[in-house]
Each structure stands twice: as structure tokens, then as C-alpha cells.
């Protein structure tokens, strides 16, 4: 089952003390089967794995990618999975750990010298031929921080949002990905109703900025489903 697959993974996403934030001083960690941490005036334990559901790689950590944990497993469930190290199999750049990228189905080091010449080739190859673009997996094509010494400005080629300067995200533009501005209040946004539909966007928008969510514009409630306009609105 999905649960047994998940529970076989490494310890991840440790909870903080109740009501606190992660990394709270005094949090204690024990080995499996559980995590030990303070709750009230006594220590409590928690299962050692907390599945983190996702729809896109950007929702996961930089050392993770978003995918279904088992082939033919629970349909529609995608969670954040640990990135794959060098020489491990991959289907897209996102699956490889930072400092690596996916070439011919294997995670290889993103050596600055040879990587730049291949970047367009691998992005186009992924978009055009790789079945993973349409199978419900999201694609986080990602440049290692080694690629650029400075964060990408608007319009710079990127592979992950962390390659872009603050206030920008990495989004698809034609067959490559560039840094685009994070959406502000009132700007039109994309709400992905159908899972995997973001894989079909040629001009991808960034997500809504801090404190905003993508919702139907008030005066568009009466419109037909297909013409409903979504904008970034305050929570």
C-alpha cells in the first residue's frame, strides 16, 4: 500500500513542539519508530513519516520533487519525494538533487562547462519527447545554484525558482523556462482544475505572492466555467 511505501522512507518533516514553528529550540529527535518531541510538559512521539502532498515541484523542498510514490499506486496522489543523487535514474531534471540534472535518464553532475551548451537541448527534449510531461507529473526543470553566481533577473533562463531573484519565479515560456514576476494582488492567475493541466501551458504564470490566493473574480461568478477569470486576492 501507499502507506507502507511511505513509512519505509527516511525520517522526514519532524513536527515542532505544539503550537510552535519548525526548528524550535529544545525539540528532541529520537530514532524510529517515532520522533520524540516536547508537547505540554511531557515528551510525545510521532510516526516518523509525514507525507507531504503536492501538485508541483515548487511546493516541495529544494531537495525533493513532486511525483506519485508508486507506479500504478493511489491515483491522483502526488507527494514530495527525496531527490535522486548522481548516477540514479531520472525522467526529468527535477528528480535530480541540486548540482545535478537529468541526461539520458540518469542524474549527472551539472558541470558548468558542458551544461550550458546542453541546457536548451535537454529542456526541448523533455518538453517534446518525454512522456512525463503529460502523465500527471509536474516538471521542475532546475538549474543548480552553481550555474549562475547571481540570481536570475526577469527574463533570465532558469530551471528552478531558486535560480531567480526575490519576487520572481521560474515559469515556462515557449520551450524553455525564464524568471517571471510573482503575481500581485488583482493580477490574473491560473487555477489548475485538472491534475497535470499545468504540463500543457506554454506561457506559464507564476504563483500568487505572499498573503494572496488564486480565486474566482467576484463579478465572474455567473460566467460559464470555461470563462471564469481567476485573480490573486487577499486571504
Amino acid at each position: 500500500t501507499l502507506n507502507s511505501v511511505l513509512n519505509s522512507n527516511a525520517i522526514k518533516n519532524l513536527p515542532p513542539p505544539l503550537g510552535g514553528a519548525a526548528g524550535h529550540p529544545g525539540s528532541a529527535v529520537s530514532a524510529a519508530p517515532g520522533i520524540l518531541y516536547p508537547g505540554g510538559n511531557k515528551y510525545q512521539t510521532i510516526d516518523n513519516y509525514q507525507p507531504y502532498p503536492c501538485a508541483e515541484d515548487e511546493e516541495c523542498g529544494t531537495d525533493e520533487y513532486c511525483a506519485s510514490p508508486t507506479r500504478g499506486g493511489d491515483a491522483g496522489v502526488q507527494i514530495c519525494l527525496a531527490c535522486r543523487k548522481r548516477r540514479k535514474r531520472c525522467m526529468r531534471h527535477a528528480m535530480c538533487c541540486p548540482g545535478n540534472y537529468c541526461k539520458n535518464g540518469i542524474c549527472v553532475s551539472s558541470d558548468q562547462n558542458h551544461f550550458r551548451g546542453e541546457i536548451e537541448e535537454t529542456i526541448t527534449e523533455s518538453f517534446g519527447n518525454d512522456h512525463s510531461t503529460l502523465d500527471g507529473y509536474s516538471r521542475r526543470t532546475t538549474l543548480s545554484s552553481k550555474m549562475y553566481h547571481t540570481k536570475g533577473q526577469e527574463g533570465s533562463v532558469c530551471l528552478r525558482s531558486s535560480d531567480c531573484a526575490s519576487g520572481l519565479c521560474c515559469a515556462r515560456h515557449f520551450w524553455s523556462k525564464i524568471c517571471k514576476p510573482v503575481l500581485k494582488e488583482g493580477q490574473v492567475c491560473t487555477k489548475h482544475r485538472r491534475k497535470g493541466s499545468h504540463g500543457l501551458e506554454i506561457f506559464q504564470r507564476c504563483y500568487c505572492g505572499e498573503g494572496l490566493s488564486c480565486r474566482i473574480q467576484k463579478d465572474h461568478h455567473q460566467a460559464s466555467n470555461s470563462s471564469r477569470l481567476h485573480t490573486c486576492q487577499r486571504h
Epitope: 526548528g23 507531504y52 502532498p53 503536492c54 529544494t62 496522489v77 525558482s161 494572496l212
Partner: nanobody, 125 residues
Framework: EVQLVESGGGLVQAGGSLRLSCVVS????????MGWFRQAPGKLREIVAA????????YYADSVKGRFTISRDDAKKTVYLQMNGLKSEDTAVYYC??????????????????WGQGTQVTVSS
Amino acid sequence: EVQLVESGGGLVQAGGSLRLSCVVSGGTFSVYAMGWFRQAPGKLREIVAAISRTGSSIYYADSVKGRFTISRDDAKKTVYLQMNGLKSEDTAVYYCAVDGRANGERPAVAGYNYWGQGTQVTVSS
């Protein structure tokens, strides 16, 4: 200060239903994944259900599949857990947890970094 407040717990007969709510207040961050956990006396705290930022990916523990439904309302910064067909083994303290991130922030590993104080659910047979 960030606060997560759960409500909706209580005593219910086996086979009955309850709807838990958790409201996130304070803090200026985007809420990513949201989840419900539970802890029965003498047992480990375990995940019950979790929902992704967009709501398109939902995880359920095997023990609650087909009986519990998680949903979220971003406008209200609230996550819900609809619990139907309750069994005595569902008796536990239920906690909600969320992943709150400042704009552009991305941790190495995604996780739930804000937790509520819990609400008691007791199912009598």
C-alpha cells in the same frame, strides 16, 4: 503570532459523523500543504489526511480512506476534516498542521511547521 485553532471535536456514537475545522490566524505567509494528525492514548501521533496547496493532491491514511474527507478554504485560511462512519478506533486527539512559508521561501525539505493544540474526538460503541 501564528495560531492554529481546532474545533468540532466531541463525543459521538459509532457510525456517526463529525466535522473538524482548523483556522490559521496571524503571520504573513502563504499556506502550502495542510494536514490532520491524531494521537490516541499510548500511541504514536499519526497522519490522518493532508491536502496540497492547490487542493489537487490529497493523501489519506489507509485506515480512514472512504470515510474521511479533507478540504481547505484559502479565503478563510481554514482546513476541514469531515469524518463519517466513525469507529471506536478513531478515538484520539486530532491536531491540524500547516506549512506556512514567506514569499519565495523554499526549505530543503517540505514539512508542517505550525501545529494546533488539538481537539478531542471520542467515539463510543
